[in-house]
């Protein structure tokens, strides 16, 4: 006999990176017929929702009107059908951004390079932080973590045209509190590649969707969160 129900999906709309004082909605999708959903924050019960009518609803939303550092952290949800509870969802890392300062992002040797040249990004923030994150715009995206007292290096190695794009970085004060984003740096990679072995080893993280972060409260742009399965958030762990 089945002891638990399948775990629900959890995600944040419009994005798991939330500028401070902005709104965010945590969504939990379980099954039709669920009579109760519980949202847990850092291991403790945070909120409860009982959908009506349960047989016509398979998703609930927990609204946070004013994001701040106290609300940033790890969320999970569970649901109940009758007396049977589900497995807990994956953990959702909700990050507050636009905290304190703005880092500076630069790239060496420059923003325009030839395919095959070695490229290194530098993210600098003079206030006290030791962790930095480099993000590339778009659905197919690199997310890298770097460390340093005031500056982190992000060596991309020999680049290909797959590395073309717009990059930004954050300083991270802890796993769930990030700085303002840096100004964007657009990397242009020119030249035809003859050596296909130069393709990046790990060219994509399907999670980044930086574009949705930029459009947080202006458009309420949505994406199919169930597809990306929290890859970027795994970076935080």
């Amino acid at each position: 006999q089945q002891q638990t129900l399948p775990k629900p999906f959890i995600w944040a709309e419009p994005h798991f990176m939330v500028p401070k004082e902005k709104q965010v909605t945590i969504c939990c999708q379980g099954n039709y017929g669920a009579v109760e959903y519980q949202l847990h924050f850092e291991g403790s019960l945070f909120a409860v929702d009982r959908p009506k009518p349960p047989e016509r609803i398979n998703k609930v939303q927990f609204y946070i009107p004013d994001m701040n550092s106290r609300m940033a952290g790890q969320y999970s949800c569970i649901y109940r059908v009758g007396e049977l509870w589900s497995e807990p969802s994956n953990l959702l890392d909700l990050v507050v951004t636009e905290m304190y300062d703005t880092p500076t992002l630069s790239v060496h040797p420059g923003p325009e390079v030839i395919s095959g040249e070695k490229v290194t990004f530098y993210c600098r923030l003079d206030t006290a932080t030791s962790m930095f994150l480099l993000l590339k715009e778009g659905r197919s995206s690199h997310v890298q973590r770097g460390y340093g007292k005031v500056q982190a290096e992000f060596p991309l190695g020999p680049v290909t045209t797959a590395h073309r794009g717009t990059y930004r970085c954050f300083g991270s004060y802890n796993n769930h509190a990030w700085s303002f984003p840096s100004e964007p740096v657009k990397l242009l990679v020119t030249g035809d590649i003859e050596n296909t072995s130069l393709a990046p080893e790990d060219p994509t993280f399907p999670a980044d969707t930086w574009g949705t972060y930029l459009l947080t409260t202006e458009t309420g742009l949505q994406k199919d969160h169930a597809l990306w399965d929290h890859t970027a958030q795994n970076l935080l762990r």
Epitope: S106, H108, P109, I114, E117, K118, T120, T190, D192, N195
Partner: antibody, heavy 118, light 107 residues
Framework: EVQLQQSGAEVKKPGSSVKVSCKTS????????MHWVRQAPGKSLEWFGG????????SYNQKFKGRATLTVDKSSSTAYMELSSLRSEDTAVYYC???????????WGQGTTVTVSS | DIVMTQSPATLSLSPGERATLSCRAS??????LHWFQQKPHESPRLLIK???QSISGIPARFSGSGSGSDFTLTISSLEPEDFAVYYC?????????FGPGTKVDIK
């Protein structure tokens, strides 16, 4: 010690081609892109183009595109610059220069004088 | 293309004097600006990278400043071997472009 040794001076007729070589030593050839810069008599420096020996990827100054060809021979750690359909305005000293990935052109060849004259 | 301009075209100074050379880009290039020195019948030599960063082996009297589109190379006290032509270079985007040069000669 990093060295870039260029081939000797050339005198060419208008309409012909010239190929200048740049033999490198003292570093890993494939790790740095090689660029070519020319300098007409009494004039400033003009970037010609660059090539990554690692990939064979190239970037050319559009002013020379179609007439210029940059190549490398990895086995001999040598870069080549070929310019076709020469005209008198191409008379210049041609330099090869290594582009460091943490700065700019950090090592230069001694220069090759190309004279185009009928 | 990014056009680099330099001023003055010629700077006549005596040894021991301070030299201030200017370079302007036709659009913002952040700090992707490099300075080169060239003496007659010699290849150029990299002096300053990324507007203000020093290069190993280059005397400390050479310094750079600026960001965006306006840059300065300063030679704090001219030595006899510093009389040469100085070029700034756009390292931001292709085509990589050089300024017309500033000639520093002996007064």
């Amino acid at each position: 010690e990093v060295q870039l040794q260029q081939s000797g001076a050339e005198v060419k007729k208008p309409g012909s081609s010239v190929k200048v070589s740049c033999k490198t030593s003292g570093y890993t050839f494939t790790e740095y892109s090689m660029h070519w810069v020319r300098q007409a008599p009494g004039k400033s420096l003009e970037w010609f183009g660059g090539i990554s020996p690692n990939s064979g990827g190239t970037s050319y100054n559009q002013k020379f595109k179609g007439r210029a060809t940059l190549t490398v021979d990895k086995s001999s750690s040598t870069a080549y610059m070929e310019l076709s359909s020469l005209r008198s305005e191409d008379t210049a000293v041609y330099y090869c220069a290594r582009r460091d990935f943490h700065s700019s052109f950090d090592y230069w060849g001694q220069g090759t004088t190309v004279t185009v004259s009928s | 293309d990014i056009v680099m301009t330099q001023s003055p075209a010629t700077l006549s100074l005596s040894p021991g004097e301070r030299a201030t050379l200017s370079c302007r880009a036709s659009q913002s290039i952040s700090d992707y600006l490099h300075w080169f020195q060239q003496k007659p019948h010699e290849s150029p030599r990299l002096l300053i990278k990324y507007a203000s960063q020093s290069i190993s082996g280059i005397p400390a009297r050479f310094s750079g400043s600026g960001s965006g589109s306006d840059f300065t190379l300063t030679i704090s006290s001219l030595e006899p071997e510093d009389f040469a032509v100085y070029y700034c270079q756009n390292g931001h985007s292709f085509p990589l472009t050089f300024g017309p040069g500033t000639k520093v000669d002996i007064k």
